[in-house]
């Protein structure tokens, strides 16, 4: 097991997950750790505890390894980091990788007010309701940005989008969470359609909502942007 010493001078590895950092309960996920060609061992940590290790074979590429989680559960959802060893030196820790398990317990209802088809600039609010009491709700836009909207609420949360622009067009789903890494089943999708004339640039928000406060849960998992949310709903899109 890796020992903390002052010798940790090697650059930090990059960590990412495929097909997604959101994994349905019981499904598998691959965690990749990319270090150096000279690496003799990689170690994966989960919530600060030693999880797994891999000693790459010289016949294979040694600069990255794959850790396979065969069945994702609430017990394996959380924050992962990895390290690698080269010679006597250990690397610094990778950036944290946040793995979320979905498909737990219940399914929320999602609807949009005033209606799913609105005109440009109209105020729109999404509502997410889960009969099972939960502490936080998440709203995701499929193939959207790499941010998730979240709001605290007991049984219901509302997500005011402000005056909508064409950037708001798309399909949304919501989740209730039992903690930050254990989420409900996804709601049925709701598609927001925007009608109207030429878009007024003054209506365009700085981020895809009119308030940055709602966009807190950042999904990017490394500085190279290797993890995006384009495969949230299709676990076969990446190999």
């Amino acid at each position: 097991q890796r020992i903390n010493t002052e010798k940790e001078t090697l650059p930090k590895p990059i960590i990412w997950a495929k097909p997604s950092i959101m994994v349905t309960n019981g499904n598998s996920v691959n965690i990749w750790c990319q270090g150096a060609q000279s690496a003799s061992e990689y170690q994966l940590y989960f919530e600060g505890s030693f999880f797994a290790l891999e000693r790459p074979k010289p016949s294979r590429s040694m600069n990255k390894v794959r850790f396979f989680i065969s069945q994702m559960t609430s017990h394996t959802a959380g924050i992962y980091t990895c390290f690698y060893q080269s010679g006597e030196l250990w690397s610094k820790s990778s950036n944290p990788l946040k793995l979320v398990v979905t498909g737990l317990y219940d399914t929320p209802n999602l609807w949009v007010y005033p209606r799913p088809e609105v005109t440009l600039g109209e105020n729109v609010t999404f509502f997410c309701q889960l009969k099972t009491a939960t502490s936080k709700f998440f709203l995701l836009k499929e193939r959207g940005s790499n941010h998730i909207q979240n709001k605290y609420g007991n049984i219901q949360a509302e997500f005011p989008m402000g005056p909508v622009t064409r950037a708001h067009r798309g399909t949304y789903r919501c989740f209730g969470s039992y903690n930050d890494y254990a989420w409900s089943f996804p709601s049925e999708p709701v598609t927001l359609l925007i009608t109207g004339g030429v878009e007024n640039s003054s209506l365009a928000p700085t981020d895809p909502t009119s308030s940055l406060d709602y966009w807190e849960f950042d999904l990017s998992t490394n500085e190279s942007g290797l993890q995006k949310d384009s495969a949230f709903w299709d676990h076969t899109t990446q190999n």
């Epitope: 797994a52 891999e54 074979k57 396979f68």
Partner: nanobody
Framework: EVQLVESGGGEVQPGGSLRLSCAAS????????MGWFRQAPGKEREFVAA???????YYADSVKGRFTISRDNAKNTVYLQMSSLRAEDTAVYYC????????????????????WGQGTLVTVKP
């Protein structure tokens, strides 16, 4: 569905040896990573040793040099050879499997394992 059945436990004197066996049902054994854990009375379950599908091994510091994990894919069995046994090795020993797995992954964290045996008791006393 994988079923794991441990055997070989018993009572032994300090300094003695035992070999635990874990027989796995099904055809998936060759694609499984295997591990041994133990739980002493009143304590949490702890990692002992693990072996990847490609025979890479890893041991807890407390058993390194005394215990050896091995596997026989033809017999669908994983072994834990225990020598120089101490009183603090007294525990129920559990065999666990990760099915399927990949390459040389060695799993140390108990929640990574998705199949568990019922356990076999090892008692070390004079």
């Amino acid at each position: 569905e994988v079923q794991l059945v441990e055997s070989g436990g018993g009572e032994v004197q300090p300094g003695g040896s035992l070999r635990l066996s874990c027989a796995a049902s099904g055809r998936t054994f060759a694609s499984a990573a295997m591990g041994w854990f133990r739980q002493a009375p009143g304590k949490e379950r702890e990692f002992v040793a693990a072996i990847s599908r490609s025979d890479d091994t890893y041991y807890a510091d407390s058993v390194k040099g005394r215990f050896t994990i091995s596997r026989d894919n033809a017999k669908n069995t994983v072994y834990l050879q225990m020598s120089s046994l101490r009183a603090e090795d007294t525990a129920v020993y559990y065999c666990a499997a990760v099915v399927p797995t990949y390459g040389s992954n060695i799993y140390v964290y108990s929640a990574a394992y998705n199949y568990w045996g019922q356990g076999t008791l090892v008692t070390v006393k004079p």
